[in-house]
């Protein structure tokens, strides 16, 4: 149980481009062939203008072609639905493919992939249905660009929509060792971060997000998976006793704003008869500002190290209130190997801590949408998209 | 280009100090762990220490207290102070960039050319 | 400190011979383990991370194997230009020794 840390299967929210609460000022798009197919006719189900975006320029064989969505927030985006140009039964243009860039800070674009690596997501088949593809894994992202393709020179048209939830952890980037490959006389088990965004130098992993999280925890047998067709230890990010001399992994967490820091939930494997153990404690520190020093003593949390139950579990560590934007934890070996399958902070933005990232003045000028204000995680009124067996999603 | 280049190498007399610098080019060193080599005339590989992206140190138990790693972010500079120093630390110094393969596990990947500190009176 | 041991410390060879080099650890290092071939007056080249992993460039006949405290390193068909010292390194996050080094000289 991950009490506290968001549910991906009920973060399938619309998040407005169907019904308008994001205004046209926020979608943007590389060119238009006209003001009909402009951006603002590329919401889903709608039949203004001309019937939706239509790029300048040709998407094959370059695809350079975009449409770009600004959600005025960091989200979690679980599912993309996507139109052809229908317009009454005269549009015929629709897109049988396309890619998906995303970015938290405007500055660094991420390219999609699924879990196997494919950045090239199936579209439409005709130009009036919708086709909702479920993101596995989800991007967190501020702004989503939806990047046609085809495969030769013809007229493509796009209506989309998000799916998803506020992102309400805050969390920009972690940073950790690179996760490692356990040798067990049967298999292979690899332990690293596969879905991690950011970059990769030397040991380490930094200035991203990825499976760590996903909201998707581990099972009790890391060698299994929650997802089909992946590899033995899939859900879990591992690493060594053997590799840290010292003792612990340490990580490092930065975050959207100043906030105070309540707790920290790590889910961990347990399997002791493989060598995965809960770690036998951490250690946090805090800091405001990047080229600030670590302030005053960690917090310390000793845990356990349990060898009882081999079952996977969520550990809680208090925080204490400690302010912070950036967090350093040193998470303490008990055994051969530690293995988190998720890590999420419950913590409230401090007052008067205005958003520390992107710094202006990149940003369009003008209020952000009141739709999102409230910081609720679901619009109200509304009902996720479902994600069940035999529903239209890819 | 992505490489490493030592300098500082020199002869110098029993008992003083010595500060050896490697510059990186085409990569930032804050974001790797970086160690120090050296290699004595017609014998083994010896590690010296390392720096880890955090700034925490680690020394082989003979060069604790004599040899200190740093390091100059703006610079891009790693450096090994060498203090005390002897006729046995005669030998080729060479800075390495430690780098993951696809099991997660380290590697040197990348090396300087070294520089050679000849400890004689 | 960890201490890591090779053998043989040298091997005499001819061209197209299967050449085992071996590297013990004074206690388990699990997969934390580098092997790197030196030519004279050259530095280090990476061939073997994580006891098995082949570096960028490194030719299929070199293999490696082990885990624990034994470990090897196999070159299947020797080629004239794989006549230099080849080191073993245990390389965690942290301490990191080399073995003494094992010479395949030309027989």
């Known amino acids: 149980d991950m009490k506290g840390h968001f549910d991906p299967a009920k973060c399938r929210y619309a998040l407005g481009m169907q019904d308008r609460t994001i205004p046209d000022s926020d979608i943007s798009v590389s060119s238009s062939w006209s003001d009909s197919t402009a951006a603002r006719h590329s919401r889903l189900e709608s039949s203004d203008g001309d019937g939706a975006w239509c790029p300048a320029g040709p998407v094959f064989p370059k695809e350079e072609e975009y449409l770009q969505v600004d959600l005025r927030r960091l989200h979690l985006v679980a599912l993309v639905g996507t139109q052809g140009r229908h317009a009454g039964g005269l549009g015929k243009e629709f897109s049988r493919s396309y890619r998906l860039r995303y970015s938290r800070d405007g500055r660094r674009w991420m390219d999609w992939k699924d879990r196997w690596g494919q950045e090239v997501i199936s579209g439409n088949e005709d130009p009036g249905g919708v086709v909702l593809k479920d993101l596995g894994p989800p991007m967190v992202a501020r702004l989503v660009r939806f990047y046609p393709r085809a495969d030769r020179v013809m007229s493509v048209c796009l209506r989309v929509e998000l799916y998803g939830c506020l992102w309400r952890d805050g969390l920009l980037s972690y940073t950790a060792p690179v996760g490692q490959t356990m040798q067990l006389s049967e298999v292979m088990v690899h332990l690293n971060d596969s879905t991690y965004d950011g970059y990769t130098a030397g040991g380490l992993q930094y200035g991203g997000l990825g499976q760590l999280a996903d909201g998707v925890v581990g099972l009790d047998d890391f060698r299994q998976s929650q997802e089909l067709r992946v590899w033995p230890g899939y859900d879990y990010v591992g690493w060594s006793n053997q590799s840290f001399p010292t003792g612990y992994v340490e990580m490092e967490f930065e975050f959207d704003r100043l906030r105070t820091f309540q707790t920290m939930q790590v889910h961990c494997n347990n399997m002791h008869t493989l060598g995965a153990r809960l770690p036998g404690g951490v250690e946090c520190r805090f800091k405001r500002g990047p080229a600030m020093a670590w302030e005053g003593e960690p917090v310390r949390h000793a845990l356990g190290g349990s060898l009882g139950d081999p079952r996977a579990r969520a550990i809680s560590v208090p925080l204490g209130g400690h302010v912070g934007r950036f967090l350093q934890c040193r998470f303490l070996f008990a055994g051969p190997w530690l293995l988190f399958s998720e890590i999420s902070f419950i913590s409230d933005v401090v007052n008067d801590s205005s958003d520390t990232f992107p710094p202006a003045p990149w940003w369009p000028p003008g209020p952000p949408p009141t739709n999102f204000s409230s910081l609720e995680l679901e619009p109200r009124g509304q009902q996720p998209v479902a994600k069940a067996e035999g529903s239209p999603t890819a | 280009q992505v490489q490493l280049v030592e300098s500082g190498g020199r002869v110098v007399q029993p008992g003083r100090s010595l500060r050896l610098s490697c510059t990186a080019s085409g990569f930032s060193l804050n974001r790797y762990y970086m160690l120090w080599v050296r290699q004595a005339p017609g014998k083994g590989l010896e590690w010296i220490g390392t720096i880890s992206y955090g700034d925490t140190t680690y020394y082989a138990s003979w060069a604790k207290g004599r040899f200190t790693i740093s390091r100059d972010n703006s610079k891009n500079t790693l450096y090994l102070q060498m203090n005390s120093l002897r006729a046995e630390d005669t030998a080729v110094y060479y800075c390495a960039r430690a780098d993951t393969g696809d099991n997660g596990y380290l590697g040197l990947q990348l090396w300087g050319q070294g520089t050679l500190v000849t400890v004689s009176s | 400190d960890i201490q890591m041991t090779q053998s043989p410390s040298s091997v005499s060879a001819s061209v197209g011979d299967r050449v085992t080099i071996t590297c013990q650890a004074s206690?388990?290092?699990?997969?934390?383990l580098a092997w790197y071939q030196q030519k004279p007056g050259k530095a280090p080249k990476l061939l073997i991370s994580g006891v098995f992993d082949l570096a960028s460039g490194v030719p299929s006949r070199f293999s490696g194997s082990g885990s624990g405290t034994d470990f090897t390193l196999t070159i299947s068909s020797l080629q004239p230009e794989d006549f230099a010292t080849y080191y073993c390194?245990?390389?965690?996050?942290?301490?990191?020794?080399f073995g003494g080094g094992t010479k395949v000289e030309i027989k």
């Open positions: 206690q388990s290092i699990g997969s934390v």
């Open positions: 390194q245990y390389i965690p996050y942290g301490s990191s020794p």
